[in-house]
């Protein structure tokens, strides 16, 4: 299946966290295909981070792309980690918080946390940059969102949505002020380039989110972070896309690109490091 | 200069553990900027990756689902060297093995392989 | 697990011409830190496989600048600029985003 992008308009009310994906195929958008058939299908809508219904011509298309509403859940859902309702108080921490830490059989030195079960609290480490397990976040909070109990003994989502121990309801954590402008895209375009540990001399690209452009910059060839692209292309694919204009009532519009279909990288990556 | 020299049987009878050996010279099995593989190939499969094992503030390993109840692979620090075993083995286990380093510093990649052992699965 | 599919299996070859050959990945290749997880390997007849480009497009140590690598997300290519008789045996390319580590089956290269 070919890889494509298709720009749409996207309103929505409320504002979520980075999405976090179990398959980056999760991320394309819906692909009905240049044929003309009316097959009943459904996708995984990064946006309302739901499965969905589309219709599929028949030919083509693309990965995100699946016969039952079951099957679009169980490729990118993430249940085990994101089960926003839960039917109990004592929440369950996703198997994956048990996982040793584990550093990957590359070695980048890479700052990254894991949940240890022996100390019951998440922990730094050095993450190699490839392979490894679930159990690695980018961040410290989100670690602690997905795999430490709360204080009152629950789990906390990283939905930043806490379970209401007293009527079982779902308290929102936090509320933003909506701004005219906010960067809704990849994380790591906010950070600043970093050459890295290693003697190398490689030309790279970074995301200047001061400027708005994508600008060069030398890579030692280890280590480093995520901003950082190995064309003008790849980083203005990754990072440009994701300013959003906000409308009335803190809604998002998201805005509209048109242009002809074309193969594209997709620029939402998983944060999670894929499971063994 | 990193050598791989395998050694082991290359006939195993059915049902039967396949055993080999992989001794390094030119680079340590405890080394924090390596790896250690066993990949097989065969007509039917081409190159199939079977586990890898590695040293960093311990040991860690990895084995492919395929053979993960079957396999383990381990270390001989004393000896500098690593084996595979594969149990409960079948015709479709023939094929010729491999032992491979992965470099883990800058060439991330299988850049030394053992010179490749035929094992025949057969009564 | 990802599949990753080399086309053309067979490719002959004129000494001084050009080749080319095909990789794609069941899915994208996760691009982080600026590296794409893809290795490309030559299976010289009678040898063991042996490492040409990292990451890539990075050229393994020893290896002619006539072999180069490129391509993100689903689709890479490993290029030979001047095919010579010595670059004749199986290419492999071989993924390392997730595991298991997987490989293509091979594109067999040979003189005309």
């Known amino acids: 299946d070919s890889e494509e992008d298709e720009e749409h308009t996207i309103i929505t009310d409320t504002e979520l966290p980075p999405l976090k994906l179990m398959h980056s195929f999760c991320a394309f958008k819906a692909d009905d295909g240049p044929c003309k058939a009316i097959m009943k299908r459904f996708f995984f809508n990064i946006f309302t981070r739901q499965c969905e219904e589309f219709i599929y011509g028949g030919c083509e298309g693309n990965q995100n792309r699946f016969e039952s509403l079951e099957e679009c859940k169980k490729m990118c859902t993430r249940d085990n980690a994101n089960r926003i309702i839960k039917t109990t108080l004592q929440q369950e921490k996703p198997d994956f918080c048990f996982l040793e830490e584990d550093p990957g059989i590359c070695r980048g030195y890479i700052t990254r946390y894991f949940y240890n079960n022996q100390t019951k609290q998440c922990e730094r480490f050095k993450y190699g940059g490839c392979l490894g397990n679930m159990n690695n976040f980018e961040t410290l909070e989100e670690c602690k969102n997905i795999c430490e109990d709360g204080p009152n003994g629950f789990q906390v989502d990283n939905y930043g949505t806490q379970l209401n121990a007293v009527n079982n309801s779902l308290t929102p954590q936090s509320t933003k002020v909506p701004s005219l402008f906010e960067f809704h895209g990849p994380s790591w375009c906010l950070t600043p380039a970093d050459r890295g540990l290693c003697r190398a001399n490689e030309n790279r690209f970074y995301y200047n989110s001061v400027i708005g452009k994508c600008r060069p910059f030398k890579y030692s060839g280890c280590g480093g972070n995520e901003n950082n692209f190995t064309s003008k292309q790849e980083c203005l694919r990754a990072c440009k896309k994701g300013f959003i204009q906000r409308i009335s009532k803190g809604g998002l519009i998201k805005t509209k690109r048109k242009r002809k279909k074309q193969r594209v990288k997709i620029a939402y990556e998983e944060i999670f490091v894929k499971n063994m | 200069q990193v050598q791989l020299q395998q050694s082991g049987p290359g006939l195993v009878k059915p049902s039967q553990t396949l055993s080999l050996t992989c001794a390094i010279s030119g680079d340590s099995v405890s080394s924090n900027s390596a790896a250690w593989s066993w990949i097989r190939q065969s007509p039917g499969r081409g190159l199939e990756w079977l586990g890898i094992i590695y040293k960093r503030s311990k040991w860690y390993n990895s084995y492919a689902v395929s053979v993960k109840s079957r396999i383990t692979i381990n270390p001989d620090t004393s000896k500098n060297q690593f084996s595979l075993q594969l149990n409960s083995v079948t015709p479709e286990d023939t094929a010729v093995y491999y032992c491979a380093r992965w470099h883990s510093d800058k060439m991330w990649g299988f850049d030394d392989w053992g010179q490749g052992t035929l094992v025949t699965v057969s009564s | 697990d990802i599949v990753m599919t080399q086309s053309p299996l067979s490719l002959p070859v004129t000494p001084g011409e050009p080749a080319s050959i095909s990789c794609r990945s069941s899915?994208?290749?996760?691009?982080?830190?600026?590296?794409?997880?893809l290795n490309w390997y030559l299976q010289k007849p009678g040898q063991s496989p042996q490492l040409l480009i990292y990451k890539g497009s990075n050229r393994a140590s020893g290896v002619p600048d006539r072999f180069s690598g490129s391509g993100s997300g689903t689709d890479f290519t490993l290029k030979i600029s001047r095919v010579e008789a010595e670059d004749v045996g199986v290419y492999y390319c071989?993924?390392?985003?997730?595991?298991?580590?997987?490989f293509g089956q091979g594109t067999k290269v040979e003189i005309k």
């Open positions: 899915q994208s290749l996760v691009f982080r830190f600026g590296i794409t997880y």
């Open positions: 071989q993924q390392y985003d997730s595991y298991p580590l997987t």
